[in-house]
Interface confidence: low
């Protein structure tokens, strides 16, 4: 009779992560008597999958019965698979010896190549805001996936980037792979409502690539442009001074008026108007009586935005005669009335 | 609904190529092993080609092996079989089949596609 | 390469009737047999895979038993939609192979 043969009919299994895999293998014959092993690897360091004839494998069902004597069978099935499971799966036949079974023959052996999807990408910014004309960077991690080819993309608001760096680790064989990239993206003071997209397609993802999303009003800082006017009101002797704080963003804001130096008032922005593309608009205005100044006032708006270093726009009012209109409060964003006459 | 349906046969000299496509719908085709079997007019079915989920292993007839080329492209849900040195002896109906169970081998087939004919004659 | 044999040929049957065909594999395939439904002009379809196991929404009539190299597939009451040629396939070595397959025909 002719010589049994262990065989091992497919090359390589390809299992997606939490699936269950089919090892296959049969035997042509029945003889010699003793028990199939399945191992993970080759040489003295492989890792015992299955015994047939003892132990517990929680994991492994068998194909077929083999407790049936005519059983030729030997296929498993090995449950839950993980990434860590990855690796050549050998169909080994044994022959009943005393004390121990004898190794006989060994199948070819069955690449399992397991298939895990990336984790969603999570995109994260600069630590600090940056204003328009800045290029600042984001990173994209994903990890987990496998095998290791793996594709990343990063948009602006719809548009390709092209100016970023990805790396897969390890460089080596894995049972799974991390993809870390860095995008430059230069910022415009149109950006509060921009976002930054990192696009990860892997083969285990069937065309619906994973996508990670930063904002950029979280990013970007626009500073404020400061306008001051006057125009008379109400009696000859009363003159309102507006100081108008156009586009900035974020919110945070605090508006100091000066007269001749000295702080006359501080506020906060609260009341303001939003414009189109996200920044926002902000007016305060003083109400000066003139009469009771004999010289010129010098009136300052001091604006702190966000922490950052003051930016201050001054106004000379003019006390040496009755005051005229001095350009117009073209601010239709006119958001609370706060008066204060200087004595 | 699942779909297969098979394109690109026809009548065709001996020596000649063809090139017959199998576009897959309402499933997750990359999911799947994939076959092509075929059925001469009158006889019976002989399987042909079988290609993995990722295309990494590729199993062919000896009948057609070093002649025809099974491939696939799971971004467009497309398995192809690129016939060369096409003989008389080919000509057949041609199905493309599906298998059964996900990320196992090509073993057994369901569904199959409706059939394209080949006809090769001088 | 394994070789299947179906028989019979061909078989002659009332509606009603049990019917079973036989498949004998050239060597030991263990449990990796199908079994394939055909009617005329159309595609193949999957009546039992695992030599015993039943395709979803195929009729429970249909049963599949054998293992290792004889195989027999039963229609336990034909009916008239049941007319049509049956192939067997064993699916664990490569190359695949059918057997030339059993007629099943009115009498």
């Known amino acids: 009779e002719e010589e049994l043969q262990v065989i091992q009919p497919d090359k390589s299994v390809l299992v997606a992560a939490g699936e269950t895999a089919t090892l296959r293998c049969t035997a042509t014959s029945l003889i010699p008597v003793g028990p199939i092993q399945w191992f993970r690897g080759a040489g003295p360091g492989r890792e015992l999958i299955y015994n047939q004839k003892e132990g517990h494998f929680p994991r492994v069902t068998t194909v077929s019965d083999l407790t049936k004597r005519n059983n030729m069978d030997f296929s498993i099935r090995i449950g839950n698979i993980t990434p860590a499971d990855a690796g050549t799966y050998y169909c080994v036949k044994f022959r009943k010896g005393s004390p121990d079974d004898v190794e006989f023959k060994s199948g070819a052996g069955t690449e399992l190549s397991v298939r895990a999807k990336p984790s969603a990408p999570v995109v994260s910014g600069p630590a600090a805001r940056a204003t328009p004309q800045h290029t600042v960077s984001f990173t994209c991690e994903s990890h987990g996936f496998s095998p290791r080819d793996i594709t990343l993309k990063w948009f602006k608001n719809g548009n390709e980037l092209s100016d970023f760096q990805t790396n897969v680790d390890p460089v080596g064989e894995s049972v799974s792979y991390s993809i870390h990239s860095t995008a430059k993206v230069v910022l415009t003071r149109e950006d509060v409502h921009s976002q930054v997209i990192c696009e990860v397609a892997h083969v285990t993802l069937q065309g619906d690539p994973l996508r990670g999303t930063a904002n950029l009003s979280e990013t970007i800082r626009v500073p404020p442009t400061l306008e001051v006017t006057q125009q008379p009101v109400r009696a000859e002797n009363q003159v309102n001074v507006t100081c108008q704080v156009r586009k900035f963003y974020p919110q945070r804001l605090q508006l100091t008026w000066l007269e001749n130096g000295n702080v006359s008032r501080t506020e906060t922005a609260s009341t303001v108007t939003e414009n189109k593309d996200g920044t926002y608009n902000w007016m305060s205005w003083l109400l000066v009586n003139v009469s009771a100044h004999r010289d010129d006032v010098k009136l300052t708006c001091q604006v702190e935005h966000d922490g950052q270093p003051a930016v201050s726009k001054s106004h000379d009012l003019k006390v040496s005669a009755h005051p005229k209109e001095q350009g117009s409060n073209t601010a239709a964003e006119n958001t609370g009335s706060n008066e204060r006459n200087i004595y | 609904e699942v779909q297969l349906v098979e394109s690109g046969g026809g009548v065709v000299q001996p020596g000649r190529s063809l090139r017959l496509s199998c576009a897959a719908s309402?499933?997750?085709?990359?999911?799947?092993?994939m076959a092509w079997v075929r059925q001469a007019p009158g006889k019976g079915l002989e399987w042909v080609a079988s290609i993995w989920v990722d295309g990494s292993n590729k199993y062919y007839a000896d009948s057609v092996k070093g002649r025809f080329t099974i491939s696939r492209d799971n971004s467009k849900n497309t398995l192809y079989l690129q016939m060369n040195s096409l003989r008389a002896e080919d000509t057949a109906v041609y199905y493309c089949a599906t298998a059964v169970e996900t990320y196992s081998g090509p073993n057994w087939f369901d569904p199959w596609g409706q059939g394209t004919l080949v006809t090769v004659s001088s | 390469d394994i070789q299947m044999t179906q028989s019979p040929s061909s078989v002659s049957a009332s509606v009603g009737d049990r019917v079973t065909i036989t498949c004998r594999a050239s060597q030991g395939i263990s449990s990796w047999l199908a079994w394939y439904q055909q009617k005329p002009g159309k595609a193949p379809k999957l009546l039992i895979y695992a030599a015993s196991s039943l395709q979803s929404g195929v009729p429970s009539r249909f049963s599949g038993s054998g293992s290792g190299t004889d195989f027999t597939l039963t229609i336990s009451s034909l009916q008239p939609e049941d007319f049509a040629t049956y192939y067997c396939?064993?699916?664990?070595?490569?190359?695949?192979?059918f057997g030339g397959g059993t007629k099943v025909e009115i009498k």
């Open positions: 309402g499933f997750t085709f990359a999911h799947y092993g």
């Open positions: 396939q064993q699916a664990i070595y490569f190359p695949i192979t």
